[in-house]
Structure formats: C-alpha cells, structure tokens
C-alpha cells in the first residue's frame, strides 16, 4: 500500500513539476526590467527564451520574437536546449510511469516489469528536473553577470551632461517557476525510484524450491508467496505485501488469453 502511495505521489508531483517546466519555458518573464534605478519608468521591459516584450503604461504590450538563431547568445541557446531536453525527458517519463503505476493493470504485466518502468521513469524525472534547474540557473547566472556589467557602465558615454540610464534586468517570475518545477520533478523522480525498490522482487527473500511434477509444472513457494501457473513467466514470484490479501491479478491462477501473447 505504501509503495502504491509513494509511486502515485511521485507521479503526481512529477506531473506538476513537468507542467511547471513547460509553463516556465513558455513564459515571457525570464528577465524583467530592474526598476530600482528608474522606478518611475512608464515603459516596462521583460524577456523570455523566445521573445522580448515591452509593456507601455497604457497597457499596450508589444512582443517581438527572436527570429534569428545564429545571432542569439550561446548561453540562451544552451538554456533553451536544457529546458527542451527537460520537457522531452519528462514527457517520456510521464508516459512510461503511467504504464508503471501499480493501480493500473495492463494485461498480466509483472511487478518486476512495473518496477523497471518505475525506475526508468524515476531516472527520467530526475534528469528532467536537473535539466530544468540547470537551465534556469545558467540563465540566472547570465542575468547576474549582465546586471553588474550594466551597473558599471550605467552613466558612461555622455560626459556627465545627459543621463542615459541603461536598462538593467533582474530575475523574472519564470526563473522561480522553473526552480520550483525542476525541484518538484526531481522529488517526484526520487519518489518513483524509492517506489521501484518496493516493487522489485528481492532475490534474497525468494528461497523457493521448485518441484516439477508430471503433467503441468507448478512451483511451490514458502509462505508469503503463492504458486503461479506453469504458463508464461512461471518462475516469477509475487510477494503479498498486505498480509495475505490478494490483488486482482494474483487471484487468477489459471491461464488467461493474455498469457499466450
């Protein structure tokens, strides 16, 4: 029961995390104009991974896409790549984890198969979360560097006669969404990996002696395990976690149509 809960919770947390990563990637507020030096500006600038926007005090917002690929900074391209990789891995992880969920039955899929799928999706979520965190952190580092560079150059070039306030950018909402989403995906992935340990058959516990009788093969197991049919994967053992209560697929002791596939 605890394993199912851990797996289910891991899936939900990862789902929220990946939705957050997608949202952060699409958001325009990766960097927003720093108003500390010019709090009275009537024009507000903010930038995303795909376009930059200007909101005028009238409420009119104009956004322009980055229509160049080669002209963009390498760091921005790297951030884009990291976020996309994170989304792709996360999406695949979600797809795999749906089939791995203990509460969902697909044919006579064994717990060991579900355990492997849970581990796979867990690793994918961990990598996805790390990609998002890395992407957001790289962008944040880029902002910090540019912020201090623009601060140093803020009032240069006009001989002190005319103030030319250079626009500085600070952390936008997307960065925080990205960090949180990446963290959630990472946590979800770890939970999936923990759930996998509970799902996987532990060889050390399976001190089963197999007696082959004439007719059809039946493997007899010590207490806590039940005999499986001699059809299909007859050497796979299923552990009963709830003190003898049988799950739906464990009650089936005769071959079904799925066993022949």
């Amino acid at each position: 029961m605890a394993v199912t809960a851990c797996q289910g919770l891991g899936f939900v947390v990862s789902l929220i995390g990946i939705a957050g990563i997608i949202a952060a990637t699409c958001m325009d507020q990766w960097s927003t104009q720093d108003l500390y030096n010019n709090p009275v500006t009537a024009v507000f600038n903010y930038q995303g991974l795909w376009r930059s926007c200007v909101r005028e005090s009238s409420g009119f917002t104009e956004c322009r896409g980055y229509f160049t690929l080669l002209g963009l900074p390498a760091m921005l391209q790297a951030v884009r790549a990291l976020m996309i990789v994170g989304i792709v891995l996360g999406a695949i992880g979600l797809l795999v984890s749906i089939f791995a969920l203990k509460c969902i039955r697909i044919g006579s899929m064994e717990d060991s198969a579900k355990a492997n799928m849970t581990l796979t999706s867990g690793i994918m979520f961990i990598v996805s979360g790390l990609c998002a965190i890395a992407g957001v952190s790289v962008f944040a580092n880029m902002l910090v560097t540019n912020f201090w560079m623009s601060t140093a150059n803020m009032y240069t070039g006009m001989g002190g006669m005319v103030q030319t306030v250079q626009t500085r950018y600070t952390f936008g909402a997307a960065l925080f969404v990205g960090w949180v989403a990446g963290g959630l995906t990472l946590i979800g992935g770890v939970m999936m990996c923990i759930a996998c340990r509970g799902l996987a058959p532990e060889e050390t516990n399976y001190k089963a002696v197999s007696y082959h009788a004439s007719g059809h093969s039946v493997a007899y197991k010590p207490g806590g395990f039940k005999a499986s049919t001699g059809f299909g994967s007859n050497t796979k053992n299923k552990k009963i976690y709830d003190g003898g209560a049988r799950t739906e697929d464990e009650v089936q002791s005769y071959p079904s149509k799925h066993d022949y596939v």
Epitope: T41, N45, E56, F60
Partner: antibody, heavy 119, light 113 residues
Framework: QVQLVQSGAEVKKPGASVKVSCKAS????????MHWVRQAPGQGLEWIGM????????NYNEKFKSRVTMTVDTSTSTAYMELSSLRSEDTAVYYC????????????WGQGTTVTVSS | DIVMTQSPSSLSVSVGDRVTMTCKSS????????????LTWYQQKPGQPPKLLIY???TRESGVPDRFSGSGSGTDFTLTISSVQPEDFATYYC?????????FGGGTKLEIK
C-alpha cells in the same frame, strides 16, 4: 465617435477645492487610461496624473500628489479630478485626455475647464 | 523629472517654407527593449486642446498630413514641416512619454512672417 465633455468654468477662493468632471462617450470607458493635464494662461502644458477606470489605479505627478484626487464613476463613464488647497497659481485650463492604446500618448482631449482661483 | 527643452521658442515663417524645430531631453527617451523613442509631438491652436501629431518620435498619428515628420533618437529630436500651410500656424509641444511624470517642453510658436 469618441467624445470627452468636461464640466463648466469654476471660480474658487484660495484654500478651497475644485472638482472637475469629464464624461466619456463613443468608446469603452474602462479600457483606457484617463489623463489630466493643465495649462496656465500663456504657459505650457503640465501633466497632473492619470487614472485607469477599470482598476481605479492612479499615477500622480509628485508635485500634485498631496492635493489631487482622481476618481471615476463607471456607471456614468465619468472621470473626476479634485484639486484641494487651491492657490492663485492653480488658475489654469484643466484638460482630460484619453490614453491611446497603441501608444502611450493621449489621442482624445476634452474641451477644457477653466478654473480661476481668486480672492 | 526629465526636463524637456524646445528651441526656438518662436519661429516666423512664410507659407510653403520648410520648418524645423528641436526638442532636447535631459535623459534618454530611447527604450532598449524595443528600440523606440518615447517622445510625442503635439500641435495646439489658441482656445483649443492639444492635438497629437507624432508619437514614438517618428510615427505619425492617423489623419496627420505627411508634411509633418519626426526624427531623432535618445535625447535630441526634431519636428519638420516640409511645406508650411496656413492651418499649421500654432504652438508645438514635445512631451516625454518615457518616465513619470510625463513632462512637456516649453513649446515652439510658429508665426506668419
């Protein structure tokens, strides 16, 4: 078509308050900022502040912040500008102007309200 | 506050003349985010409210004759009337639209010679 009709001329004594109204028609009143600008006799233009009818949010010129109050009545599509503690230098023509959505410049102006402050 | 300085304060010209008036701001009105200059030009005739001519330093408002053109960037701006018509004799104001409070220049009065 867009129209901004302002209230009539006012004569006030120093220290008193004046409330100028601006009735809008021909457009969605709640979608545009309403600006207030004044012009003293023979002088240039001076921006007082602005109000957004939908949210009621305001932005005042620091010079007038302590004395000005801008309000709106969305049911009648009317904007109000109240200036308190009047002085003789507040004698001017007060204009309301609608905020143009595609740029931040006002594109429709009221006919102006003459406020005279005299003892 | 941004100080807007217009010159000359008055200008005497004949119909058909080409006219140029300047506006200087104490701070740059160029927004790096979209490379637009937030400067507006108004025309005002006696007893009338101002009329918007040009915004974003060079974009003509709809209905404004093409003899009016705006140029400049950063802190220096120019309004040019290619061929002055009788209805153009008025006072012209530039306005900072970049920073609160929005400030106006002192105006340039265009008079008949």
């Amino acid at each position: 078509q867009v129209q901004l009709v302002q209230s009539g001329a006012e004569v006030k004594k120093p220290g008193a308050s004046v409330k100028v109204s601006c009735k809008a028609s021909g457009y969605t009143f709640t979608s545009y900022w309403m600006h207030w600008v004044r012009q003293a006799p023979g002088q240039g233009l001076e921006w007082i502040g602005m109000i957004h009818p939908n949210s009621g949010s305001t932005n005042y010129n620091e010079k007038f912040k302590s004395r000005v109050t801008m309000t709106v009545d969305t049911s009648t599509s009317t904007a109000y500008m109240e200036l308190s503690s009047l002085r003789s230098e507040d004698t001017a023509v007060y204009y309301c102007a609608r905020r143009y959505y595609g740029s931040i410049s006002p594109d429709y102006w009221g006919q102006g309200t003459t406020v005279t402050v005299s003892s | 506050d941004i100080v807007m300085t217009q010159s000359p304060s008055s200008l005497s010209v004949s119909v058909g003349d080409r006219v140029t008036m300047t506006c200087k701001s104490s701070q740059s009105l160029l927004n790096s985010g979209n490379q637009k200059n937030y400067l507006t030009w108004y025309q005002q005739k006696p007893g009338q409210p101002p009329k918007l001519l040009i915004y974003w330093a060079s974009t003509r408002e709809s209905g404004v004759p093409d003899r009016f053109s705006g140029s400049g960037s950063g802190t220096d701006f120019t309004l040019t009337i290619s061929s002055v018509q009788p209805e153009d004799f008025a006072t012209y104001y530039c306005q900072n639209d970049y920073s609160y409070p929005f400030t106006f220049g002192g105006g340039t009065k265009l008079e008949i010679k």
